[in-house]
């Protein structure tokens, strides 16, 4: 069964940021700013054709 | 530190798992200067199909 889409699970550490409870709440400014920066960053990295987007962003303590 | 986990979607056949990881790793320096994000411990794997229906791209 081919969907025409390939999915990749990616995980990484951001070592210069501290995890706090606001990263568990999508309504906080800290969560939304970090999510926006990460989304923008991935659009920059994979700007060649083929990149469809990202989803399921989760933040956890390192 | 903060661990970030996410799912990336690409048109099938346009990128392999090695290039997903390599292109991300090569951007780390720019991520530090542009977004002030110091990135390490990058791990990439393919997501077996089918997986959670809520994982639509976008």
């Amino acid at each position: 069964l081919s969907t025409g889409v390939s999915f990749f699970f990616l995980s990484f550490h951001i070592s210069n940021l501290q995890f706090n409870s606001s990263l568990e709440d999508p309504s906080t400014d800290y969560y939304q700013e970090l999510q926006r920066d990460i989304s923008e960053m991935f659009l920059q990295i994979y700007k060649q054709g083929g990149f469809l987007g990202l989803s399921n962003i989760k933040f956890r303590p390192g | 530190s903060v661990v970030v986990q996410l799912t990336l979607a690409f048109r099938e056949g346009t990128i392999n798992v090695h290039d997903v990881e390599t292109q991300f790793n090569q951007y780390k320096t720019e991520a530090a200067s542009r977004y002030n994000l110091t990135i390490s411990d990058v791990s990439v794997s393919d997501v077996p199909f089918p997986f959670s229906a809520q994982s639509g791209a976008g």
Partner: antibody, heavy 120, light 107 residues
Framework: QVQLVQSGAEVKKPGASVKVSCKAS????????MHWIKQAPGQGLEWIGY????????HYNQKFKDKATLTRDKSASTAYMELYSLRSEDTAVYYC?????????????WGQGTLVTVSS | DIQMTQSPSSLSASVGDRVTITCRAS??????LVWYQQKPGKSPKLLVY???TLTDGVPSRFSGSGSGTQYSLTISSLQPEDVATYYC?????????FGSGTKLEIK
């Protein structure tokens, strides 16, 4: 037309080093990744690693990371592979091969091969 | 590392025969599978990429198929000029491993 022309055959003594060149023409050298492949006499193909001539990024098969170093000279449109601490099992034909451009996961052009013989 | 198991290692067939070579990957390589033909004393030549796309100039008697971990190269009607060794290659993840080769001969 695209051409990859490799340097000539080499005979080396055990413990020596050798540098094989691969001169590219007929395309923009910096926009295509260059790979290197080993083929021992009568044997199959073994991937050594690659260099991205534009960024100078290299990636090696772990098996060859202490055996080979990949470099390039952009001005000469030439890729190089240096092999160190040669042993008899390094005797092989070594090929350079160009990876196709964006989303092209194959080797579309190959050099003619360079035979490296290690013998005392 | 992904291991590529190619079979058979050698094959003898008659002109006009239908010939199939198979390649099994130790993990899902998502159709990032390439086939090359190598004639004695020559460099390998690209035949098929993305498991089933025939490269320009390759005769239509060659075809590739498969998905996941199982792939095959078929020659629908063997010709004398097809005598060669055929290799599959994983292009999904490093190291970009090759199969051990199938030596094809004419009976």
């Amino acid at each position: 037309q695209v051409q990859l022309v490799q340097s000539g055959a080499e005979v080396k003594k055990p413990g020596a080093s050798v540098k094989v060149s691969c001169k590219a023409s007929g395309y923009t050298f910096t926009t295509y990744t260059m790979h290197w492949i080993k083929q021992a006499p009568g044997q199959g193909l073994e991937w050594i690693g690659y260099i991205n001539p534009g960024s100078d990024y290299t990636h090696y098969n772990q098996k060859f990371k202490d055996k080979a170093t990949l470099t390039r000279d952009k001005s000469a449109s030439t890729a190089y592979m240096e092999l160190y601490s040669l042993r008899s099992e390094d005797t092989a034909v070594y090929y350079c091969a160009r990876q196709g451009n964006y989303a092209a996961y194959y080797f579309d052009y190959w050099g003619q091969g360079t035979l490296v013989t290690v013998s005392s | 590392d992904i291991q590529m198991t190619q079979s058979p290692s050698s094959l003898s067939a008659s002109v006009g025969d239908r010939v199939t070579i198979t390649c099994r990957a130790s993990g899902n390589i998502h159709n990032f599978l390439v086939w090359y033909q190598q004639k004695p004393g020559k460099s390998p030549k690209l035949l098929v990429y993305n498991a089933k796309t025939l490269t320009d100039g390759v005769p239509s008697r060659f075809s590739g198929s498969g998905s996941g971990t199982q792939y095959s190269l078929t020659i629908s009607s063997l010709q004398p000029e097809d005598v060669a060794t055929y290799y599959c290659q994983n292009f999904w993840n490093v190291p970009f491993t090759f199969g051990s080769g199938t030596k094809l001969e004419i009976k």
